[in-house]
Interface confidence: low
C-alpha cells in the first residue's frame, strides 16, 4: 500500500507539470482536485512551482465555486487549500484498497490515477 | 486531420445484433475517453456509452445497460460498439465522440451510421 | 441524473435578429455547460464550451453565459446559417452525459 501511494503521490506530481499542456492531463486533475475538494499534491502552494503556470493562479478546480477563470488571482479564502495526495490517499486507502487491488498500471502515465467509476462513487455518497 | 469515421449501421431485426467501429485519426487515441452517443430520428441527442482511455472503466445509460458493450483497441485506434438484443426503440444515427473533459465540451464527432432495428 | 431544459423548443428569426437561447440544470453545475449546433443530416458541432467559451473556429457573433442553473447562448446577428438546432449539455456529473431536448432556430 505505500508503494502505491509513494506511486500515487509521484504521478500525481508529474501530471501538475503536465497540466499547462495537455488538455487531457488538465482534465483528470480537474476531476480529481473538484470531487475531492482540494488543491494540488500537499497543498495550494504546489502550484506556484509549476513553470508554465502563471503566478498567482491555480486550477479553476480548486475553487470553492468553480467558474471558469476563478483560480486566476485567486483569494486564498475562495480555494480549497488541502493538498490532494493526503485527501484522496486517505479515501484511498479507506475505500479502494481495502476493496480491491489498483496495478501500478492504473496509477501510471496517462492512465487515469483513480478510475472513473471510484470518483463518481466519492462524488454521489 | 482529426477525424472519427463511423461504420458497421444498418438494417437487423428485433433481438438481433450488430457491432460499430470508430476509426480515429489525427490525435493520440489512447489519451482520450471515447463516447457513443445517438439520435433517433427527429428527436434530440442520446448518450449512451463511455470508456476510459485505458478502456477499463465503462458506463452505459440505463436504455442499453445490459445489451450494449463498449470495447477499444488503442493499438488500432478503433473503439467498438457491440449491440445485442435490439429493440425498434434502438433506431437512429449513432455518433462516436470524443470525450468531454471537465471545462472542455466534445468537440470531435464522427459523421454517424445509421442502424435501423425492424422486422 | 441532471435534467436539462432548453426553452423555447422552437423560435422563428430573420437574418440580422438577436436570438438568445436559455438552458437550465435541475441543480447547480457550476460552468460545466456546453452548446452545439446541428444541422440537418450532420453531426452537431461545438460552439460554446464552460458556458462561455469560444470553441477555436466558431465565430464571434455567438457567445454564452451563465453559472450555477440558469444559461443563455446569444446569437448576436443572425446569419443565414445559423438556422439549425441548438443543444446544450451538462459536463458537471456524469455519466449520464445529459443534453437538453433541443431549440429548433428556424427562418421567419
Known amino acids: 500500500r505505500d508503494k502505491v501511494m509513494s506511486e500515487f503521490n509521484n504521478n500525481f506530481r508529474q501530471q501538475m507539470e503536465n497540466y499547462p499542456k495537455n488538455n487531457h492531463t488538465a482534465s483528470i486533475l480537474d476531476r480529481m482536485q473538484a470531487d475531492f475538494k482540494c488543491c494540488g499534491a500537499a497543498n495550494y502552494t504546489d502550484w506556484e512551482k509549476i513553470p508554465s503556470m502563471s503566478k498567482n493562479r491555480v486550477p479553476d478546480s480548486c475553487c470553492i465555486n468553480v467558474t471558469v477563470g476563478c483560480g486566476i488571482n485567486f483569494n486564498e479564502k475562495a480555494i480549497h487549500k488541502e493538498g490532494c495526495v493526503e485527501k484522496i490517499g486517505g479515501w484511498l486507502r479507506k475505500n479502494v484498497l481495502e476493496q480491491k487491488l489498483i496495478s501500478e498500471e492504473d496509477l501510471g502515465g496517462e492512465q487515469k490515477l483513480i478510475s472513473e467509476e471510484d470518483l463518481h462513487h466519492h462524488h454521489h455518497h | 486531420q482529426v477525424q472519427l469515421v463511423e461504420s458497421g449501421g444498418g438494417l437487423v431485426k428485433p433481438g438481433g445484433s450488430l457491432r460499430l467501429s470508430c476509426a480515429a485519426s489525427g490525435f493520440t487515441f489512447s489519451d482520450y475517453y471515447m463516447n457513443w452517443i445517438r439520435q433517433a430520428p427527429g428527436k434530440g441527442l442520446e448518450w449512451i456509452t463511455y470508456?476510459?482511455?485505458?478502456?477499463?472503466?465503462?458506463y452505459y445509460a440505463d436504455s442499453v445497460k445490459g445489451r450494449f458493450i463498449i470495447s477499444r483497441d488503442n493499438t488500432k485506434n478503433s473503439v467498438h460498439l457491440q449491440m445485442n438484443s435490439l429493440r425498434a426503440e434502438d433506431t437512429a444515427v449513432y455518433y462516436c465522440v470524443r470525450d468531454p473533459r471537465m471545462y472542455y465540451g466534445m468537440d470531435v464527432w464522427g459523421q454517424g451510421t445509421t442502424v435501423t432495428v425492424s422486422s | 441524473d441532471i435534467q436539462m431544459t432548453q426553452s423555447p423548443s422552437s423560435l422563428s428569426a430573420s437574418v440580422g435578429d438577436r436570438v438568445t437561447i436559455t438552458c437550465r440544470a435541475s441543480q447547480s453545475i457550476s460552468s460545466y455547460l456546453n452548446w452545439y449546433q446541428q444541422k440537418p443530416g450532420k453531426a452537431p458541432k461545438l460552439l460554446i464550451y464552460a458556458a462561455s467559451s469560444l470553441q477555436s473556429g466558431v465565430p464571434s457573433r455567438f457567445s454564452g453565459s451563465g453559472s450555477g442553473t440558469d444559461f443563455t447562448l446569444t446569437i448576436s446577428s443572425l446569419q443565414p446559417e445559423d438556422f439549425a438546432t441548438y443543444y446544450c449539455q451538462q459536463s458537471y456529473s456524469t455519466p449520464p452525459i445529459t443534453f437538453g431536448q433541443g431549440t429548433r432556430l428556424e427562418i421567419k
Open positions: 470508456i476510459n482511455n485505458g478502456g477499463y472503466t465503462k
